[in-house]
């Protein structure tokens, strides 16, 4: 028989999302407007187009990344779609409230949205340490907490060190991994004896979490260059980070059979790994002046991913909880963690050049960033993830992680899907 | 040749609205940021506002945020200034200007640099009860 | 976004040189290499003359220099014409998309 959702889940869930629904809706209708400008129909659509690359990445693409799990691929999926939705929402009004409030309403512009969606995918990414083990009424707190950290640490890095659009969103990949490894860290982590197996990967969801994979491969272009803010920053940053995601995508498969005893090439490394370029590259992809400058980070960040993947999990396994395929939280913490230190070593590197005293205060300043993004991370995934731990939320008991068929309706009951 | 040309100042009374506007010509107007500058009598320049190349993005001077907007219509050439809520301080000669992006680099990294490289001849705003 | 401090008026005579400073009170200039001077004749429009600090755009004559030191960026014309007889402004990235000017320096040719 089917395992149900607790009856108090089935009254909380709907009210809760609900109710904070109508409270967004409402929101909504007090405090923003549309852009009135006037905008040229084909400069409305190539700016849509960014944002449309944007939310394929993160509904489908990180949506199907997160889906290898044996019995709960359905729920990673959709879970993912729910987050985002709300995510969204809850990112445009807090970005206005932050950044245009004083003068009046939230003024909404395809460009917010864009923002917006960067700010969602940041729980997309953090979630999959935590997916799994919580329902939908504790996803909802966690979107809610992360966006919120997320928005008001870019307003401050922008407000106190002056960083702009691209430089303050890139940290999402750091903040996103931090923020997921500290959740983690607080939920429940034994797993029964016999439900080891829910959390094993199955290859009909493996095939969609590669195509996941595909997807997020295809259109980190677009994400890495969405928020600069010239046609030439846009491009070289574009270029930049095909070449990288490119050769990490050989790296990837290639060190993947490198690291197997029998030479043999690991789902869950190549998964992760053809993306390593692309994050490694995000900082400093409208910087890097050559191809073979961004084709060496890739193959570096691939190396590293490979390597995270292949000696990390035990140990996020034992200490987080984490499961081994839920490889997004350790690869994306060590490969943002690159991208910021590419970035400081290019100020170095200038500083060496120039002898300039003030490039040496960015170094200081971009060193302070990345800390504060890192502190700010762990210290709102921790209250997140003791928020997530109150018994109102009635999380799923760990006999029931990993299982689709304690959220989902399936009228064939079938066991192995 | 490349020109900006500002229209549309005149007399008007505080608290009352203008639109300024600056057609573009001679470049490929979609490609470039756009700013608008002023320069009150006997004052230095101020910067007003600028407008990303697509229109996706808009930033504005704490003097007149939340009043006045910037927009384009990248498909007629045209930049826009609407100011509601005029003040005696906005008196001022308005000039567009636009953001050219250039670049050197050194084997390891790429230095963007932002110049006001176009001007028009400015258009004069008074704001006067 | 207080405007970057410039001497209300240097003149000098026909060869002569001369400096214009152009000084922030906070780290606008120190922070960026975005400073660039524009030369402003009456009833015109301004025209760039020094780029990215110390840059000249083609077409500008070679006795117009940029320098920066730590918060103070200058303009040094040296060789003064007549047709120097302008109003010199900087102009300094301020950060997040915004920009600074100076307060504006008007120069004499005697």
């Known amino acids: 028989m089917s395992s149900k959702y607790p009856r108090s889940v089935r009254r909380c869930l709907p009210l809760w999302a609900l109710t904070l629904e109508a409270a967004l809706i409402l929101l909504f209708y007090f405090f923003t407007h549309y852009d009135a400008s006037l905008e040229d129909q084909k400069g409305l659509v190539a700016s849509y187009q960014v944002g449309q690359d944007l939310t394929v990445m993160a509904a489908i693409g990180l949506g199907f990344l997160t889906s290898s799990f044996r019995r709960h691929s359905w729920s990673s999926v959709a879970f993912n779609l729910f987050m985002l939705a709300l995510g969204v929402q809850w990112a445009i009004l807090l970005d206005g409230f932050l950044s245009q409030f004083p003068s009046g309403k939230v003024v909404i512009t395809l460009f917010s949205i864009r923002l917006a969606t960067m700010s969602a995918l940041s729980v997309l990414i953090s979630v999959d340490a935590v997916l799994g083990k919580v329902n939908l009424a504790q996803l909802v707190v966690m979107v809610l907490v992360e966006v919120t950290a997320l928005g008001n640490l870019r307003m401050v890095i922008s407000n106190i060190f002056n960083t702009d659009y691209h430089m303050n969103m890139m940290h999402i990949y750091v903040f996103a991994a931090y923020f997921g490894l500290s959740v983690a860290w607080c939920l429940p982590k034994p797993l029964p004896e016999g439900t080891e197996d829910k959390d094993q990967t199955a290859t009909i969801p493996s095939l969609s979490a590669m195509l996941g994979a595909l997807f997020l491969w295809m259109f980190w272009p677009s994400f890495n260059s969405a928020l600069l803010r010239s046609p030439i920053e846009r491009k070289n940053a574009v270029f930049n980070t095909y070449y990288a995601v490119a050769v990490s995508v050989v790296t990837a498969i290639s060190g993947s059979s490198l690291a197997h005893p029998q030479g043999k090439i690991s789902k869950t490394y190549v998964h992760s790994a053809v993306l390593a370029g692309g994050v490694a590259v995000g900082t400093s992809c409208h910087l890097i002046p050559s191809p073979w400058l961004a084709m060496v980070l890739g193959l570096v960040a691939g190396l590293i991913s490979v390597g995270g993947a292949k000696y990390l999990p035990g140990c996020c396994n034992r200490v987080l909880g984490i499961p081994h395929s839920s490889i997004m939280g350790y690869n994306f913490s060590l490969l943002g963690l690159l991208g910021e230190i590419i970035y400081i070593v290019l100020l170095v590197l200038d500083t060496v050049g120039a002898g300039n005293g003030m490039i040496g205060f960015q170094v200081l300043l971009s060193i302070g960033e990345l800390s504060l993004a890192i502190v700010i991370a762990l210290m709102s995934g921790l209250l997140t993830g003791l928020l997530l731990n109150l018994k109102i939320w009635k999380a799923p008991h760990e006999a029931k992680y990993f299982d689709d068929q304690v959220f989902w309706k399936f009228p064939h009951l079938a066991v192995g899907f | 040749e490349v020109q900006l040309v500002e229209s549309g100042g005149g007399v008007v009374q505080p608290g009352r609205s203008l639109r300024l506007s600056c057609a573009a010509s001679g470049f490929t107007f979609s490609n470039y940021g756009m700013h608008w500058v002023r320069q009150a009598p006997g004052k230095g320049l101020e910067w007003v506002a600028v407008?990303?190349?697509?229109?996706?993005?808009?930033y504005y001077a704490d003097s007149v945020k939340g009043r006045f907007t910037i927009s384009r219509d990248n498909s007629k050439n045209t930049l826009y200034l609407q100011m509601n809520s005029l003040r005696a301080e906005d008196t001022a000669v308005y000039y567009c200007?636009?953001?050219?992006?250039?670049?050197?680099?050194?084997?390891?990294?790429?230095?963007?640099?932002?110049?006001?490289?176009?001007w028009g001849k400015g258009t004069t705003v008074t704001v006067s009860s | 976004q207080s405007a970057l401090t410039q001497p209300a008026s240097v003149s000098g005579s026909p060869g002569q040189s001369i400096t214009i400073s152009c000084t922030a009170t906070?780290?606008?200039?120190?922070?960026?290499?975005?400073v660039s001077w524009y030369q402003h004749h009456p009833g015109k429009a301004p025209k760039v003359i020094i780029t990215d600090v110390n840059k000249r755009p083609s077409g500008v004559p070679d006795r117009f220099s940029g320098s920066k030191s730590g918060n103070t960026a200058s303009l040094t014309i040296s060789g003064l014409q007549p047709e120097d007889e302008a109003e010199y402004s900087c102009c300094s990235y301020a950060g997040t998309y915004s920009y600074v000017f100076g307060t504006g320096t008007k120069v004499t040719v005697l």
């Open positions: 200007a636009r953001e050219m992006v250039s670049y050197s680099s050194s084997w390891y990294r790429r230095y963007y640099y932002y110049v006001m490289d176009v």
């Open positions: 407008i990303w190349y697509d229109g996706s993005n808009k």
């Open positions: 906070s780290s606008d200039i120190g922070a960026y290499n975005y």
